[in-house]
């Protein structure tokens, strides 16, 4: 029960996290104009990974896409790549984890297979979360560097009288969404890996005792003791009948519309 709960919770947390990573990647407010200690402008600038926007006091907002690849900073390209890799890995992880969920039954999938899939999706979520956190952190570092560089020459005098105000950018909402989402995906991945340990079948040693009964003969076969790794054959309390093998977990797995409840 605890395993199912941990796996289910891990899946939900990761799902929220990946939705957050997608949202952060699409958001325009990765960097926003710093309004502190700045002459108050009637124009507010903010930038995302894909376009930059200007919102005027008039209420008019204009966004322009970055219609170039080669002209963009390498760091921005790196952040884009990290976020996309995070989304792709997360999406694949979600797909894998759906089939790995203990509460969903697909055919006669064994617990060992579910354990493997749970571990795989968990690792994918962890890497996805790390990609998002890394991407957001790289962008944040870029902002901090540029912020202090622009502060150093914020007011550049021209002819003594004319001043130009350099627009400084600070952390936008997308950064916080990205950090939180990346963290959630990471936590979800860890939970999936923990759930995998519980799902992994342990092979228990039994004395080889043969029961002779009239009609059918049923034998409980022993298996050598192995540390549960989540891999290997699933021989946990397998009852060998001449009608075929079915694990205890599968005893009541009749095809029904309620299979995934």
């Amino acid at each position: 029960m605890a395993v199912t709960a941990c796996q289910g919770l891990g899946f939900v947390v990761s799902l929220i996290g990946i939705a957050g990573i997608i949202a952060a990647t699409c958001m325009d407010q990765w960097s926003t104009q710093d309004l502190y200690n700045n002459p108050v402008t009637a124009v507010f600038n903010y930038q995302g990974l894909w376009r930059s926007c200007v919102r005027e006091s008039s209420g008019f907002t204009e966004c322009r896409g970055y219609f170039t690849l080669l002209g963009l900073p390498a760091m921005l390209q790196a952040v884009r790549a990290l976020m996309i890799v995070g989304i792709v890995l997360g999406a694949i992880g979600l797909l894998v984890s759906i089939f790995a969920l203990k509460c969903i039954r697909i055919g006669s999938m064994e617990d060992s297979a579910k354990a493997n899939m749970t571990l795989t999706s968990g690792i994918m979520f962890i890497v996805s979360g790390l990609c998002a956190i890394a991407g957001v952190s790289v962008f944040a570092n870029m902002l901090v560097t540029n912020f202090w560089m622009s502060t150093a020459n914020m007011y550049t005098g021209m002819g003594g009288m004319v001043q130009t105000v350099q627009t400084r950018y600070t952390f936008g909402a997308a950064l916080f969404v990205g950090w939180v989402a990346g963290g959630l995906t990471l936590i979800g991945g860890v939970m999936m890996c923990i759930a995998c340990r519980g799902l992994a079948p342990e092979e228990t040693n039994y004395k080889a005792v043969s029961y002779h009964a009239s009609g059918h003969s049923v034998a409980y076969k022993p298996g050598g003791f192995k540390a549960s790794t989540g891999f290997g054959s699933n021989t946990k309390n397998k009852k060998i009948y001449d009608g075929g093998a079915r694990t205890e977990d599968e005893v009541q797995s009749y095809p029904s519309k309620h299979d995934y409840v």
Epitope: V40, V54, E56, S58, T164, V165, Q166
Partner: antibody
């Protein structure tokens, strides 16, 4: 069609207050700030401030902070400007205006002439 | 506050003439985010509110004749009327539309010679 309706003129005594109105129509009143501009006779234009009809938040030109109070009545789509402690310096035409692209004032009321005289 | 300086204060013209008036701001009105200059031009006739002519320094408002042209960037801006008509006789104001508080120039009065 965007329209900002202001009423003619106000004759007031020095030291008193006056509240002038600006009724908006032809657009969603709460979507845009309402700005106020002063024009003394034969002189240039001075921006007084603006009010956000949604939240009733205001932004003032420091010069008019103690002179003007901007308010709105959402139900009647009307913006108000109260001028207090009036002196002859406050004799002017007061316009309400709405911003457009480029933070330009594309829509103006006809103006209210406030004359401060004993 | 941003100081807007217009010159000349008065400009005597004859109809059909090409005229140019200038406006200078004490700070650069260029927004780096969209590379637009937040400078606006208005025309005002006696007894009327100002009428928007040009925003973003060079974009004509709807219905404004193409004889009106705005140009310039940074701190120096120009309004040009290619061929002055009788109905163009008015006072022209430039406005800083970038910094609060919004400020206007003292105006250039276009009058007949």
């Amino acid at each position: 069609e965007v329209q900002l309706q202001q009423f003619g003129a106000e004759l007031v005594k020095p030291g008193t207050s006056v509240k002038i109105s600006c009724k908006a129509s032809g657009y969603t009143f709460t979507d845009y700030n309402m700005d106020w501009v002063k024009q003394s006779h034969g002189k240039s234009l001075e921006w007084i401030g603006d009010v956000n009809p949604n939240y009733s938040t205001t932004r003032y030109n420091q010069k008019f902070k103690d002179k003007a109070t901007l308010t709105v009545d959402k139900s009647s789509s009307t913006a108000y400007m109260e001028l207090r402690s009036l002196t002859s310096e406050d004799t002017a035409v007061y316009y309400c205006a709405r911003l457009y692209y480029g933070n330009s004032f594309a829509y103006w009321g006809q103006g209210t002439l406030v004359t401060v005289s004993a | 506050d941003i100081v807007m300086t217009q010159s000349p204060s008065s400009l005597p013209v004859t109809t059909g003439e090409r005229v140019t008036m200038s406006c200078r701001s004490s700070q650069i009105l260029l927004n780096s985010g969209n590379q637009k200059n937040y400078l606006t031009w208005y025309q005002q006739k006696p007894g009327q509110p100002p009428k928007l002519l040009i925003y973003w320094a060079s974009t004509r408002d709807y219905g404004v004749p193409d004889r009106f042209t705005g140009s310039g960037s940074g701190t120096d801006f120009t309004l040009t009327i290619s061929s002055v008509q009788a109905e163009d006789l008015a006072v022209y104001y430039c406005q800083n539309a970038y910094f609060y508080p919004f400020t206007f120039g003292a105006g250039t009065k276009l009058e007949l010679k």
